[in-house]
Interface confidence: low
C-alpha cells in the first residue's frame, strides 16, 4: 500500500513537471511565447512557410497570420487541446486538410481569411468545433460552399464569407447556425436567394448581401429571420423585390436597396406600399425604369406615379406599351399583357377601370409598341451591379416608431406567377418580380418565377380596397 502510494506521488510529481515543462516549453524560433494572461504563441509576419513545429501544447492562442504558409496538414494543432484562438489569415493557404483542426474542441475564433488561393474547403474541416463563435473565411477565393460545411457549429455567432467568388447559396447551408447573429456575404457573385438559403438562422441580426449579382429573391427566403435588424441588398441586380419576402422581418430597422435597377411601374406598387409603412431606416430606392422616373426615389413617388408597364429594348431604354407578347425584347409578365388569362390584373386600352379591372396599366399617349428587338438583355450586367463609392451614404435617419414594421397583407389565393413556362427562366421574367404581399405565396414552378400582387387574381373585395387606396395602375 505504501509502495503504491509512493509510486502515485512519483507519478503525480512527474505529471506536474510535465505540465510545467509544457508551459515553459521552448518557443518556436520565429515566435514570441508568453503565459499571462493567456498562454500565447505569437508568430505574425515572420515569413514562415509552414506551421512551425514545437508550438507549446498549453497554448490557448496561436497567431500565425501574415506569413507564407501554404498548407495546414492534418492534426497540425492536435496537441493544443486548450486552444481558443487560432489566426491563420493573410497567408498563402492553398490546402487545408480535412482533419487540420481535429481535437480543438475549445476553439472559439478561427481566422482563415485573406488566403485567396484557398478556393475550396473540405466540408469536414470544421466538424467538431462545437464552441466556435467566430469564423473568418473572407477573401479566400471560395467558389462554393460544400454540403455540410457548417454542420454542427451551434455556437457560431459571426461568419465572414465576404469578398469571395460564391455564385450560389445552397439549400440549408446555414441550417445548424441557430445562434449566428452576423452573416457577411457581400462582394460575391450570388445571383439569387433561393427559398431555403437562410433556413435555421433564427438569431440573425445582420445580413450583408450587397455587391453581389442578386436578381431574384424567393418570397420565402427570409422566413426564419424574425430577429434580423440590418439587411443590405444594395449594388445588386434587383429590378423588383417580393414584399412577401420582407414580411417576416419583424425586427428590421436598417434596409439598404440602392444601386439596383429598380423598375418603378405598377409592379412596384407593393414594394412602394411596404416602404411607406416601414418605420425603420432605409436607403433611397432609385428607379431605373421607366425613363421618366429614372433616378427618382421609389419611396418619394406617389402611388399614381407607378403606372403602366415599362418594357426595355436594352438596358435603360424603356418603351411603354399596352400590348406585349412573349417575344418582346425584355418581355413582360402576364399582368401587363391584355391577352393574358388573368383578366383581373390587366387594363386593356379603352376599357373603363372597374372593380373587375383594378390595378391596371394605362398606355401613355404617343408611345408606340416596340418592334422585335435584339433579344433578352440583363439590366445592369456588370459583375457586382453598380458599385458604390468608397464611402457609402448613411442610411436615412428615421427612428422606428413601432417595434415591428408592418408587412403587406398576405391574404389572397395562390396563383401562378406572371411568367409562362416558356419564358420563366429567361432574364426578362425578372422584370415582373414585384412584391407578392397581396398575392399569397404563389405556387410557382421553380424558384425562377415569382408572383406579384398586381399579377394575381385578386378577390373582388381586396381589389376594391386596393383600388381605393392605391388608385388605378
Amino acid at each position: 500500500m505504501k509502495r503504491a502510494s509512493a509510486g502515485g506521488s512519483r507519478l503525480l510529481a512527474w505529471v506536474l513537471w510535465l505540465q510545467a515543462w509544457q508551459v515553459a516549453a521552448p518557443c518556436p524560433g520565429a515566435c514570441v511565447c508568453y503565459n499571462e494572461p493567456k498562454v500565447t504563441t505569437s508568430c505574425p509576419q515572420q515569413g514562415l512557410q509552414a506551421v512551425p513545429v514545437g508550438i507549446p501544447a498549453a497554448s490557448q492562442r496561436i497567431f500565425l497570420h501574415g506569413n507564407r504558409i501554404s498548407h495546414v496538414p492534418a492534426a497540425s494543432f492536435r496537441a493544443c487541446r486548450n486552444l481558443t484562438i487560432l489566426w491563420l489569415h493573410s497567408n498563402v493557404l492553398a490546402r487545408i486538410d480535412a482533419a487540420a483542426f481535429t481535437g480543438l474542441a475549445l476553439l472559439e475564433q478561427l481566422d482563415l481569411s485573406d488566403n485567396a488561393q484557398l478556393r475550396s474547403v473540405d466540408p469536414a474541416t470544421f466538424h467538431g468545433l462545437g464552441r466556435l463563435h467566430t469564423l473568418h473565411l473572407d477573401r479566400c477565393g471560395l467558389q462554393e460552399l460544400g454540403p455540410g460545411l457548417f454542420r454542427g457549429l451551434a455556437a457560431l455567432q459571426y461568419l465572414y464569407l465576404q469578398d469571395n467568388a460564391l455564385q450560389a447559396l445552397p439549400d440549408d447551408t446555414f441550417r445548424d447556425l441557430g445562434n449566428l447573429t452576423h452573416l457577411f456575404l457581400h462582394g460575391n457573385r450570388i445571383s439569387s436567394v433561393p427559398e431555403r438559403a437562410f433556413r435555421g438562422l433564427h438569431s440573425l441580426d445582420r445580413l450583408l448581401l450587397h455587391q453581389n449579382r442578386v436578381a431574384h429573391v424567393h418570397p420565402h427566403a427570409f422566413r426564419d429571420l424574425g430577429r434580423l435588424m440590418t439587411l443590405y441588398l444594395f449594388a445588386n441586380n434587383l429590378s423588383a423585390l417580393p414584399t412577401e419576402a420582407l414580411a417576416p422581418l419583424r425586427a428590421l430597422q436598417y434596409l439598404r436597396l440602392n444601386d439596383n435597377p429598380w423598375v418603378c411601374d405598377c409592379r412596384a406598387r407593393p414594394l412602394w406600399a411596404w416602404l411607406q409603412k416601414f418605420r425603420g431606416s432605409s436607403s433611397e430606392v432609385p428607379c431605373s425604369l421607366p425613363q421618366r422616373l429614372a433616378g427618382r426615389d421609389l419611396k418619394r413617388l406617389a402611388a399614381n406615379d407607378l403606372q403602366g408597364c415599362a418594357v426595355a429594348t436594352g438596358p435603360y431604354h424603356p418603351i411603354w406599351t399596352g400590348r406585349a407578347t412573349d417575344e418582346e425584347p425584355l418581355g413582360l409578365p402576364k399582368c401587363c399583357q391584355p391577352d393574358a388569362a388573368d383578366k383581373a390584373s390587366v387594363l386593356e386600352p379603352g376599357r373603363p377601370a372597374s372593380a373587375g379591372n383594378a390595378l391596371k396599366g394605362r398606355v401613355p399617349p404617343g408611345d408606340s409598341p416596340p418592334g422585335n428587338g435584339s433579344g433578352p438583355r440583363h439590366i445592369n450586367d456588370s459583375p457586382f451591379g453598380t458599385l458604390p463609392g468608397s464611402a457609402e451614404p448613411p442610411l436615412t435617419a428615421v427612428r422606428p416608431e413601432g417595434s415591428e414594421p408592418p408587412g403587406f397583407p398576405t391574404s389572397g389565393p395562390r396563383r401562378r406567377p406572371g411568367c409562362s413556362r416558356k419564358n420563366r427562366t429567361r432574364s426578362h421574367c425578372r422584370l415582373g418580380q414585384a412584391g407578392s404581399g397581396g398575392g399569397g405565396t404563389g405556387d410557382s414552378e421553380g424558384s425562377g418565377a415569382l408572383p406579384s400582387l398586381t399579377c394575381s387574381l385578386t378577390p373582388l373585395g381586396l381589389a376594391l380596397v386596393l383600388w381605393t387606396v392605391l388608385g388605378p395602375c
Epitope: V32, Y34, T40, S42, P44, Q45, R61, F63, H65, G66, W87, H89, S90, Q109, D111, S113, D114, T134, H136, D138, R139, Y160, S390, A391
Partner: antibody, heavy 127, light 109 residues
C-alpha cells in the same frame, strides 16, 4: 469610457534611456492597438510605432528602428515605450493613443484611427 | 512630412473654411484619412475618421472628404472655439506605418 493615463514628466541626460508607461482605465487593450506619437515643441505629430498587446510583436517607424522598444502587459492593460540613446532633439511630448483593432483578418497594424489619446508625457533631454 | 497641409488658415465666425491634405498613392491613395484637432495645450482629439465619419460628440459643422491622393476637412459656421491645430493622417503602405501632415493652424479672426 476608456481613458489612457501616462506617467509624469521626465528629465534625461543625452545618451540615456527613458521609459514611459500608458495605462488604460475603464477598459482593456485586448481588441486594440496602442501607438506612440510624439510632438516636439512647436512641431507637428510624428508616429513612432505601435503594438497589439495580444500579439506581443511591435511595429516601429523606420526612423526609430533599433532605438525604440514598445512592450505591453495585457494583464495590467499597460503599454510601455522605451527610447534609448537620447539626444536633445528627442525632447518632446510623448502621447500614447489607442487604435481600434478591427478584427481577425486585418493585419496587426492596419490603417485606423487614434482614439482616445493619453494626456502626454513631456520628456526633456538636456545635459 | 509625408502628407502636405497648408501651415495656416483663417476665417471669420460663421464662415466656411477648408483645409487640404495632399499625399501619394501609397498613403491617401490607398487608405482612409483621419483628421485630428489639437486645441492649445491639450492632446490631439479625433475629429474625422475613415475619410468622412464623425465620432459621436463632434458637431456636424465638421466634414471630411477624399478624392484620389488628396483629402480635405471643411468647417462650416466657424466658431471661435474652432481655433486649433488640425492634422490629417493616413496609413502608408510603403512605410508600413502612420504618416501625419505637418498641421494647419486655424485662426478665427
Amino acid at each position: 469610457e476608456v481613458q489612457l493615463v501616462e506617467t509624469g514628466a521626465e528629465v534625461k541626460k543625452p545618451g540615456s534611456s527613458v521609459k514611459v508607461s500608458c495605462k488604460a482605465s475603464g477598459g482593456t487593450f485586448s481588441n486594440y492597438a496602442v501607438s506612440w506619437v510624439r510632438q516636439a515643441p512647436g512641431q507637428g505629430l510624428e508616429w513612432m510605432g505601435g503594438i497589439i498587446p495580444i500579439f506581443g510583436i511591435p511595429n516601429y517607424a523606420q526612423k526609430f528602428q533599433g532605438r525604440l522598444t514598445i512592450t505591453a502587459d495585457e494583464s495590467t492593460s499597460t503599454a510601455y515605450m522605451e527610447l534609448s540613446s537620447l539626444r536633445s532633439e528627442d525632447t518632446a511630448i510623448y502621447y500614447c493613443a489607442r487604435k481600434p483593432y478591427l478584427g481577425g483578418r486585418y493585419s496587426a497594424f492596419t490603417p485606423s484611427w487614434f482614439d482616445p489619446w493619453g494626456q502626454g508625457t513631456l520628456v526633456t533631454v538636456s545635459s | 512630412y509625408e502628407l502636405t497641409q497648408p501651415p495656416s488658415a483663417s476665417g471669420t465666425p460663421g464662415q466656411r473654411v477648408t483645409i487640404s491634405c495632399s499625399g501619394s498613392s501609397s498613403n491617401i491613395g490607398s487608405n482612409t484619412v483621419n483628421w485630428y484637432q489639437q486645441l492649445p495645450g491639450t492632446a490631439p482629439k479625433l475629429l474625422i475618421y475613415s475619410n468622412n465619419q464623425r465620432p459621436s460628440g463632434v458637431p456636424d459643422r465638421f466634414s471630411g472628404s477624399k478624392s484620389g491622393t488628396s483629402a480635405s476637412l471643411a468647417i462650416s459656421g466657424l466658431q471661435s472655439e474652432d481655433e486649433a491645430d488640425y492634422y490629417c493622417a493616413a496609413w502608408d503602405d510603403s512605410l508600413n506605418g502612420v504618416v501625419f501632415g505637418g498641421g494647419t493652424k486655424l485662426t478665427v479672426l
